[in-house]
């Protein structure tokens, strides 16, 4: 067989279907890999060719479209389940070709087994909902294409076991949930199931994603310095440990990148030659709003040392701020023979 | 270590309604639901109906669908089971159970109460 | 609703027996059957789970098997602290519905 551009095995396409639910799988070559479409491909004369690779098997073989019922089959870069099975869990292939031409690349699929909660090992997407905000919907995901819109499919919404009715403050309202106020205890699993005819067949789509609720953009605020502030003063002798911790609190933003460092005499840590080293923590509340602790810590200080600015930094999306810790050096206290014979007025 | 305590023992007259409370202990910070049950004199189990404090969520079997009331007051972490237009065949002892989540296939009877007997009689 | 049917409806055994319980669902219940254990008085217990995991705390001598429609309950070597009223469960499907219960009872 002539040379064919191999894409590999795309791994970043790690599809996960449910055990006997249908599924629509779009060839990735046309998605990532190349620069034109099916349609374009199909009217040059391309051909699309669909093979797998069994799980935990080295050969590849046709896959058959000649199941009962049509349970495979392949409609335009669409190969369809309906629905799948367990062992259908393998490496798909499909090829593009022609005479002259050949591309193709291979994709995992992995068929899932829930249990009657909709626990699976399926990877669920994330979505943040702020609290206390007003209306917010979640959509049932991943559902467009598996029947015409002259069908009207049932959604019934689930948290975990329990299907969603006479909640206090989640109505679901067809493909949509809405959250009329979200709060904390809406955090959690939601599945949707949908429920459609099929040539005298009934097939269910599942899928769930997980609610986050977070910190709301009403409530957000420039980053809040802790520490270091101006009530506590780091005293210390020449060659005690010097240890500042920069503190500071950030409200959870969308996409906000949050930033902490540290100046000294107003340059980076790593510019100047003191043997400084800085160590930090992030912890997150409940509504994945952020502490983040850096500790700036010189092992042996110097009179020098204690001479320097030290100055913590923070910058959210929400604005920039600084906090200058307090350093001075302990003054020794006088010594006690000393002071003694000078009261005694001798020489 | 979660406990579920149920009311004491009540003695009902036909036609009229009883509430019979549970109170979780221990409960954890996420929301799981409060199960209802009951097993009349020698009998099997059966299944009432359900509530989710935290959240509000009910529902209940199509066979207690009118008579039944289940309500929860999340400040005293108790639920109550309301049971109306009372006959000699609800005589039965009442069980409320619970699992730690919503999300545990199987386990959402994990942990009983103690039961409540409740007597219809004239 | 999904109808379970529990057999038999008594079980005499000998201490150190083994004992063998079926439930058998209407219809399909995948592996979403649980069994419960009673003893006079006493609350129901969970013993077993997703057809065959034992809950916490449960001894070995429990065991349980099958999916679909039928499953099984098997007490190795019965003790006597075994004896009890044996009760399953599925919850596939809303309602959710017990057996009527099986009782074991000492031979």
């Known amino acids: 067989s002539e040379r064919c551009d191999d894409w590999g095995l795309d791994t970043m396409r790690q599809i996960q279907v449910f055990e006997d639910e249908p599924a629509r799988i779009k060839c990735p070559l046309f998605e990532h890999f190349l620069k034109f479409n099916y349609s374009t491909a199909h009217s040059a004369g391309l051909t699309l060719i669909w093979y797998w690779t069994r799980q935990d098997r080295d050969l590849e073989e046709p896959i058959n479209f000649r199941l009962p019922e049509n349970r495979i089959s392949k409609e335009k870069d669409v190969l369809w389940f309906r629905p799948t099975l367990l062992n259908d869990t393998g490496n798909y292939t499909c090829m593009l070709r022609n005479t002259t031409y050949c591309s193709k690349v291979a994709f995992p699929l992995e068929v899932v087994q829930k249990d009657s909660c909709f626990n699976s090992p399926m990877k669920l997407p994330v979505h943040k909902l702020y609290i206390e905000y007003g209306i917010q919907r979640i959509t049932c995901p991943n559902v467009d294409g598996y029947f015409p819109s002259s069908v009207k499919p049932t959604i019934t919404w689930y948290m975990g076991c329990y299907k969603i009715q006479n909640f206090n403050n989640v109505i679901p309202e067809g493909m949509n949930l809405s959250f009329l106020i979200a709060l904390i205890s809406n955090n959690g699993n939601y599945t949707c199931v949908v429920t459609y005819p099929e040539n005298g067949r009934t097939f269910h789509l599942t899928r769930t994603l997980t609610v986050k609720v977070v910190g709301s953009p009403k409530n957000a605020v420039p980053p809040v310095i802790h520490s270091p502030n101006d009530h506590v003063v780091y005293e210390k002798e020449p060659g005690e440990e010097l240890l500042i911790p920069c503190t500071v609190y950030f409200s959870f933003l969308m996409d906000s990148r949050n930033e902490v460092w540290w100046t000294i005499d107003g340059k980076k840590p790593d510019d100047i030659t003191i043997d400084v080293t800085i160590n930090e923590s992030i912890s997150h509340s409940r509504t994945e709003d952020e502490t983040r602790t850096q500790i700036l810590s010189i092992k042996k200080v110097t009179s020098e040392d204690l001479k320097r600015s030290y100055v913590c930094h923070a910058r959210s999306a929400k604005g920039e701020v600084a906090k200058a810790a307090k350093v001075k050096q302990k003054v020794p206290a006088p010594r006690y023979t000393v002071e003694l014979a000078c009261g005694f007025g001798a020489t | 270590q979660v406990q579920l305590v149920q009311s004491g023992a009540e003695v009902k007259k036909p036609g009229s309604s009883v509430k019979v409370s549970c109170k979780a202990s221990?409960?954890?910070?996420?929301?799981?639901?409060i199960q209802w049950v009951r097993q009349a004199p020698g009998q099997g189990l059966e299944w009432m109906g359900y509530i989710i404090p935290s959240l509000g969520g009910y529902d209940y079997a199509q066979k207690f669908q009118g008579r039944v009331t289940i309500t929860a007051d999340e400040s005293t972490s108790t639920a109550y089971m309301e049971l109306s237009s009372l006959r000699s065949e609800d005589t039965a002892v009442y069980y409320c159970?619970?699992?730690?989540?919503?999300?545990?296939?199987?386990?959402?009877?994990?942990?009983w109460g103690q039961g409540t007997l409740v007597t219809v009689s004239s | 609703e999904i109808v379970m049917t529990q057999s038999p409806a008594t079980l005499s055994v000998s201490p150190g027996e083994r004992a063998t319980l079926s439930c058998r669902a209407s219809?399909?219940?995948?592996?979403?059957l649980a069994w419960y254990q009673q003893k006079p008085g006493q609350a129901p217990r969970l013993l077993i789970y997703g057809a065959s995991t034992r809950a916490t705390g449960i001894p070995a001598r429990f065991s349980g098997s099958g999916s679909g429609t039928e499953f099984t309950l098997t007490i190795s070597s019965l003790q006597s602290e075994d004896f009890a009223v044996y009760y399953c469960q599925q919850y596939n499907n809303w309602p959710w519905t017990f057996g009527q219960g099986t009782k074991v009872e000492i031979k």
């Open positions: 159970a619970r699992g730690q989540t919503l999300y545990e296939s199987g386990r959402q009877f994990d942990i």
């Open positions: 221990g409960s954890p910070a996420e929301p799981y639901a």
């Open positions: 219809q399909s219940v995948s592996s979403n």
